[in-house]
């Protein structure tokens, strides 16, 4: 099946301009946004620090860790009240992402 | 509203020992990383250090032995400087290290002078 | 030693115009695009503009444009105006575990013509 211009591939996502059209389904994550083409029981997340298609179940229950969203070699956790996850590099750094 | 604020710096001779204070509101030092920088008058931005939650703070290669960064309770951040000099004369910020330094606190100046 | 050469040191401006602000780290950022750009005026802490090399912050104009990866990066302020005279930062962010987790670069005063 070929693809339209500026169409996306089912299970796939990009990353867009703040400006671009807002009739796209869309989700903030650490402030990037994203336009994302996500089959049947996925939503748009985020995997390896990138927007991604990610399983539905993740987002309902709140166990965002499961989406792999942090960089490989990082670790992740919950914050209090799974209100976002903490990324944290291997030197200990750590990256906070909320989600609203 | 996630804000900063530093204090405690004052005018102190060569060779004291001075500690800063940044108390964050808004946000939670359990969850994201704090970093000090200075300004010495008219002159750029430098990095002293890092400290995120329970991990150990890193400090700017210059900046080891000198400086200590802790977390002193679950809202402040301490600086001490030990031996200072004329050359560590400077605004102090600390800012929320996360995505970028954002918010910064509006900085609170340290003189060092006989 | 974790070094981010920043380049032009100044540069001026007409209302309207184009500013290109280079920064080139001395080895490879954090995940490749872990540098920010700051912008300060005097007697203010810096402020914000963009992080991961492309992302704009929260409320800032988008006549700021970031580019680059790995360790070249490039600041773009378009149809430059009044209020953009300040000096303005890159920071690049390392692993913590081998280097200086941060660093700044020297810096980029822009004046308006």
């Known amino acids: 099946q070929f693809l339209k211009e500026g169409q996306l591939a089912a299970g796939t996502c990009e990353v867009i301009a703040a400006h671009r059209d807002s009739s796209q389904p869309r989700r903030t994550i650490a402030r990037q946004t994203a336009r994302c083409a996500c089959r049947k029981g996925q939503i748009a997340g985020t995997t390896r620090a990138r927007p991604a298609c990610v399983d539905a179940r993740i987002i309902k229950t709140k166990q965002w860790c499961d989406m792999l969203p942090c960089l490989e070699g990082e670790g992740c956790d919950l914050l209090i009240n799974r209100s976002g996850w903490t990324c944290t590099q291997p030197g200990g750094r750590i990256k906070t992402t909320t989600v609203s | 509203q996630e804000q900063l604020v530093e204090s405690g710096g004052r005018l102190v001779t060569p060779g004291t020992t001075l500690t800063l204070t940044c108390t964050v509101s808004g946000f939670s030092l359990s969850s994201y990383g704090v970093s000090w920088v200075r300004q010495a008058p008219g002159k750029g931005l430098e990095w002293i250090g890092y400290i995120a939650n329970n991990y150990n703070p890193h400090y700017a290669s210059w900046a080891k032995g000198r400086f200590t960064i802790s977390k002193t309770s679950s809202t402040t951040v301490d600086l001490k400087m030990t031996s200072l000099t004329t050359e560590d004369t400077a605004t102090y910020f600390c800012a929320r290290d996360n995505y970028g330094m954002d918010p910064w606190g509006p900085g609170t100046l340290v003189t060092v002078s006989s | 030693e974790l070094d981010l050469t920043q380049t032009p040191s100044s540069v001026s401006a007409a209302v309207g115009g184009t500013v290109t602000i280079n920064c080139q780290a001395s080895q490879s950022v954090y995940n490749n695009k872990n540098l920010a750009w700051y912008q300060q005026k005097p007697g203010q802490p810096p402020k914000l503009l963009i992080y991961?090399?492309?992302t704009l912050a929260s409320g800032v104009s988008s006549r700021f444009k970031g580019s680059g990866s790995g360790t070249q990066f490039t600041l773009t302020i378009s149809d430059v105006q009044c209020d953009d005279a300040a000096t303005y930062y890159c920071q690049g962010e390392f692993s913590c575990s081998s280097a200086d987790c941060n660093a700044f670069g020297g810096g980029t005063e822009l004046e308006i013509l």
């Open positions: 991961a090399a492309s």
